[in-house]
């Protein structure tokens, strides 16, 4: 996949000491709406990698047809390959399902590059390594696509976990998670632990390795350390949040915080990179370059195009700064920060140089549609999508890649005033345009 773009579409100091487990203040919150504790059956149910997406096994139809489905918090359709395609090992065969119902309606989803189109229907769906339930859900049977499926990614469909407002063809098409919550006793919450390997994986290694966990209906304590800190979901369409401050190695970027959220900031597992609005990207890169100025890297590296390679095991992580995003907290005038390491924003790339080398792409890129906290951010954290309480929680992931000197961190509280002013209000007229151009 290219750097930092919507995943299915194409290929955007100062942490707590290692091993420190902070007290979990949040454990004392009421248990509802999401069950807490152990979800053994769901742990390690994801495979994949940031560059090609993380997928979960699902079954569709009667008798059940097994498919690997990309977990995407940046869209709201459940859509699966339903016709032969050179990049698909298998696809949904509606004619073989006795429980398939045709909705006699088409759906067309164009992206900035590429598209998919298909036919809408419903069928019985379950997640083998998820809650022990079966639901009737809307399914878009993809019959035609361009630059959507990824060669070698091993997934055949996409599970859009965002809200109905951005569902296609319109918000009347109930997303899968809404159907799941409505039809079962599963609490209205899910959590994601995406585990970046820290080194490139070839296809067979991806198939054999664990990519992380999607806990449906709850929070698993074993997947994080320290405390969970929550930020409000600003609006239920994408998982929109508000960034109030950005620091590079503790140095404030000192921009008007509206710039950080222009025109929105979202948490999106279906995007590879941390994508930043143009002005913010330029300031961030300038600051990262300054922090690592003992070295000079090619222009194409900062564009996410050229790879930089070091002798295996000698990547100078210490010359690259940590990046902190401060998010609006749940309490007035209170924020918290999430801090990622270069181990998250330098993405290991498969064997392009020699086996003696470790090669990386810069996984921060420019966006014209706001900030996207993609897989490279999420790989540092256990992320709780608490839909019931309209909030997103972050804690340090138990599987994040770090070194002996620095670790990813989630820290707070910090006093931040006028955080509401950091949100950007999208003019109503622009919205329909934005919806079709998801770069």
């Amino acid at each position: 996949t290219q750097h930092g773009i919507r995943l299915p579409l194409r290929s955007g100091l100062g942490g707590a000491p290692l091993g420190l487990r902070l007290p979990r203040e949040t454990d004392e919150e009421p248990e509802e709406p999401g069950r807490r504790g152990s979800f053994v059956e769901m742990v390690d149910n994801l495979r994949g990698k940031s560059g090609q997406g993380y997928y979960v096994e699902m079954t569709v139809g009667s008798p059940p047809q097994t498919l690997n489905i990309l977990v995407d918090t940046g869209s709201s359709n459940f859509a699966v390959g339903a016709a032969p395609h050179p990049f698909l090992h298998r696809y949904y065969q509606r004619q073989l399902s006795s429980t398939y119902r045709d909705l006699r309606k088409g759906v067309y989803v164009p992206y900035t590059q590429g598209k998919w189109e298909g036919e809408l229907g419903t069928d019985l769906v379950s997640i083998p390594h998820g809650p022990n339930v079966t639901v009737r859900a809307n399914i878009a049977a993809i019959t035609e696509s361009d630059k959507f499926f990824i060669n070698g990614s091993n997934w055949e469909g996409i599970l859009g976990l965002a809200y109905a407002e951005i569902a296609r063809p319109d918000d009347s098409l109930e997303p899968f998670f809404d159907s799941l919550v409505k039809q079962t006793h599963v609490p209205n919450l899910f959590s994601l632990q995406l585990c970046g390997a820290g080194f490139p994986l070839n296809q067979s290694e991806v198939l054999a390795s664990v990519g992380g966990s999607m806990i449906i209906g709850g929070i698993d304590h074993s997947l994080y350390t320290g405390s969970l800190w929550y930020t409000p979901i600003r609006r239920e369409w994408y998982y929109e949040v508000i960034i109030v401050r950005v620091e590079i190695n503790g140095q404030d970027l000192k921009m008007d915080c509206k710039e950080y959220n222009y025109d929105k900031s979202i948490v999106d597992s279906g995007t590879t990179n941390l994508r930043l609005p143009k002005k913010v990207f330029e300031a961030a890169v300038k600051s990262i370059k300054a922090a690592s100025s003992t070295e000079k890297f090619p222009d194409g590296f900062w564009l996410g195009e050229q790879l930089v390679c070091w002798q295996a095991g000698t990547t100078p992580w210490n010359i690259f700064p940590v990046i902190s995003l401060y998010l609006m907290g749940e309490v007035t005038n209170q924020s918290f920060r999430i801090t990622i390491l270069p181990q998250q924003y330098l993405r290991p790339v498969e064997d392009v140089a020699t086996s003696q080398d470790d090669c990386y792409k810069f996984a921060i890129s420019q966006s014209s549609t706001g900030t996207v906290m993609g897989a490279v951010i999420m790989e540092g954290f256990y992320v709780v999508f608490d839909r019931a309480r309209k909030r997103i929680g972050f804690a340090v992931s138990a599987c994040h890649v770090h070194d002996e000197f620095r670790t990813a961190a989630v820290e707070g509280p910090f006093v931040t005033l006028d955080m509401e002013d950091c949100g950007y209000n999208i003019p109503q007229t622009d919205e329909s345009t934005l919806m079709t151009g998801r770069a």
């Epitope: 003992t294 070295e295 890297f297 222009d299 590296f301 050229q306 392009v352 140089a353 080398d357």
Partner: antibody
Framework: QLQLQESGPGLVKPSETLSLTCTVS??????????WGWIRQPPGKGLEWIGM???????WYNPSLRSRVTISVDTSKNQFSLKLSSVTAADTAVYYC????????????WGRGTLVTVSS | EIVLTQSPATLSLSPGERATLSCRAS??????LAWYQQKPGQAPRLLIY???KRATGIPARFSGSGSGTDFTLTISSLEPEDFAVYYC??????????FGGGTKVEIK
């Protein structure tokens, strides 16, 4: 205009250390826009990248030569140098110094080259 | 490791003719490819960078094209001074260490 000139002995004995210097004139080696590199070409053969250095002293080496190569910079003299230890006849080549420009990716300016023969 | 294969090894042409040189990468290098010209007894000279951009002072008869794995250097009408060896180099993986084996353009 900027020019590069290699200098050093043309004959080195096997097992000894080859030492070359590249003098940069008409511009500063301390420019933040460039790396400074060494490339060699055995007689009748193709080009082989040896390594390069930034004015800060940061170095990058060809993995196949890494254990034997040292590149250093002297900003006060506007020079950078190559040392290749434990040489054999296979190290006989024309050695070029070059500037790495165009987004520090391409060798956009070369010295004339100097032939170094390894022989007893 | 990315390997660059140049073809043909030798190209025999007359002045005024069009020369087409090929460089194939073992995997995609995007547009991060350069072409160099080397005349006998001289140092190489950068002709084309980023697959299609002419370096300073390079005549318009030299053009580069391609992206991904297949690249072409075209000399629209050979001048006597163009008979030389041409090398391609990829910098998709950096540092810039991979050169092709070269194509010799000789007078027919």
């Amino acid at each position: 205009q900027l020019q590069l000139q290699e200098s050093g002995p043309g004959l080195v004995k096997p097992s000894e250390t080859l030492s070359l210097t590249c003098t940069v004139s008409g511009g500063s080696i301390s420019s933040s826009s460039y790396y400074w590199g060494w490339i060699r070409q055995p007689p009748g053969k193709g080009l082989e990248w040896i390594g390069m250095i930034y004015y800060s002293g940061s170095t990058w080496y060809n993995p196949s030569l890494r254990s034997r190569v040292t590149i250093s910079v002297d900003t006060s003299k506007n020079q950078f140098s190559l040392k290749l230890s434990s040489v054999t006849a296979a190290d006989t080549a024309v050695y070029y110094c070059a500037r790495v420009g165009h987004g520090v990716s391409y060798f956009d300016l070369w010295g004339r080259g100097t032939l170094v023969t390894v022989s007893s | 490791e990315i390997v660059l294969t140049q073809s043909p090894a030798t190209l025999s042409l007359s002045p005024g003719e069009r020369a087409t040189l090929s460089c194939r990468a073992s995997q995609s290098v995007s547009s991060y490819l350069a072409w160099y010209q080397q005349k006998p007894g001289q140092a190489p000279r950068l002709l084309i960078y980023d697959a299609s951009k002419r370096a300073t002072g390079i005549p318009a008869r030299f053009s580069g094209s391609g992206s991904g794995t297949d690249f072409t250097l075209t000399i629209s009408s050979l001048e006597p001074e163009d008979f030389a060896v041409y090398y391609c180099q990829q910098v998709y993986t950096w540092p810039p260490r991979t050169f092709g084996g070269g194509t010799k353009v000789e007078i027919k």
